[in-house]
Interface confidence: medium
C-alpha cells in the first residue's frame, strides 16, 4: 500500500544554470494523498533558510504529482544560490533537498550551449 505521507521530490544536489534577465520557474514536486499541504520556499543563507514571503508562487497539478512553483520574473544576478521547499503536514515539517541556481550574467553567456554541454548538463534545457 502506497504511503500517504507528503513527499518532496527534489533530487539531492540538483542544480539549474539560468540566464539573468530571463523568467524562470523553480519547481518543487509534491506528492500527497487527500489534502494539499501548505508548501513554502526558502533561500539558504549559511546554515539558515530564509523564507521567501513576497515572491510569486503557484501550483501546477498533474495526474500523479503536483508542483509548487517559485517564479522568477525575471532572474536577477543575486538569485544565485541554493533553495529548499518545505511542507507543513499534520503538524510535521517536511524539508526537501536543496536545489542550486547558477545565474549567468548576459554579458558572459555564450551564444548557446554546445551539444556536448547539453548532453552532460541537461538542466541547461531550462534556460
Amino acid at each position: 500500500k502506497e504511503s500517504c505521507d507528503v513527499q518532496l521530490y527534489i533530487k539531492r544536489q540538483s542544480e539549474h544554470s539560468i540566464l539573468a534577465g530571463d523568467p524562470f520557474e523553480l519547481e518543487c514536486p509534491v506528492k500527497y494523498c487527500a489534502n494539499r499541504p501548505h508548501v513554502t520556499w526558502c533561500k539558504l543563507n549559511g546554515t539558515t533558510c530564509v523564507k521567501l514571503e513576497d515572491r510569486q508562487t503557484s501550483w501546477k497539478e498533474e495526474k500523479n504529482i503536483s508542483f509548487f512553483i517559485l517564479h522568477f520574473e525575471p532572474v536577477l544576478p543575486n538569485d544565485n544560490g541554493s533553495y529548499r521547499c518545505s511542507a507543513n503536514f499534520q503538524s510535521n515539517l517536511i524539508e526537501s533537498h536543496s536545489t542550486t541556481l547558477y545565474v549567468t550574467d548576459v554579458k558572459s553567456a555564450s551564444e548557446r550551449p554546445s551539444k556536448d554541454e547539453m548532453a552532460s548538463r541537461p538542466w541547461l534545457l531550462y534556460r
Partner: antibody
Framework: QVQLQQPGAELVKPGASVKLSCKAS????????MHWVKQRPGQGLEWIGM????????NYNEKFKSKATLTVDKSSSTAYMQLSSLTSEDSAVYYC??????????WGQGTSVTVSS | DIVLTQSPASLAVSLGQRATISCRAS??????????MHWYQQKPGQPPKLLIY???NLESGVPARFSGSGSGTDFTLNIHPVEEEDAATYYC?????????FGGGTKLEIK
Amino acid sequence: QVQLQQPGAELVKPGASVKLSCKASGYTFTSYWMHWVKQRPGQGLEWIGMIHPNSGSTNYNEKFKSKATLTVDKSSSTAYMQLSSLTSEDSAVYYCARKRGGLGDYWGQGTSVTVSS
Amino acid sequence: DIVLTQSPASLAVSLGQRATISCRASKSVSTSGYSYMHWYQQKPGQPPKLLIYLASNLESGVPARFSGSGSGTDFTLNIHPVEEEDAATYYCQHSRELPYTFGGGTKLEIK
C-alpha cells in the same frame, strides 16, 4: 546560423482568427524562450508575450491575454501565435524573436496581418 | 507596468555629428548593479536590431560609434560620428520585470 521564418502576410476577415507561425532553425529550439511583438503601421513596438518551448510555460502581457494564445510544436521547431476575434486594431506586423536574457537577439522578418472584409 | 518615455520623438543630425537619444523609465530598471535597459535600431520594412544590452554593452557586430549609458530611470543612446546608414528609428526596451515594454521610438534623420 540562427533563423526564424515567418510567412510574409495574412489577410483575414473581422471576427475571424488567425494562427501565425515562426519556424526556428540553427539552434536548439527547446533551450530558449520565444517572444512575440506587435507593431502597428507607423507605430512603436508592443510586447505580447513569450513561451518556453521545452515546458510550454507562457507569460503574457495582460493587454493581450484574451487576444493571443502562444503554443509550440517541438517536433517541427515551430512557435505559433493564435489571434482571435480580429478587428482593425489587430492589423499590424507581428514579429517572433528568440529570447536571450530579456532581449530579442534574433528576430523573424515579421508577418503582416491585415483585417479587412 | 513600467512606462518608457523617449525623447526627442525625432531629430535631424548632420553627418559626422553626435546624436543623443534619451529614455526615461517610470521606475528604476536597475538592481544588483545591473541596468535592464536595451536599445534597438529599426529601419523601414525590417525587424528591430539589438544595438546595446544592459544599458552600456555593445552587441556583437555593432559599430563602436554606438554607445549607451545610464542607470536607475535615466538612459542615453549616443551615436558619434553619425553616418548615413544610421537613419532609422531607435527604441529602448526594459527587461526588469514583466511585462517588458518599449519606448515610443525616436526617428533619426541625417542632414
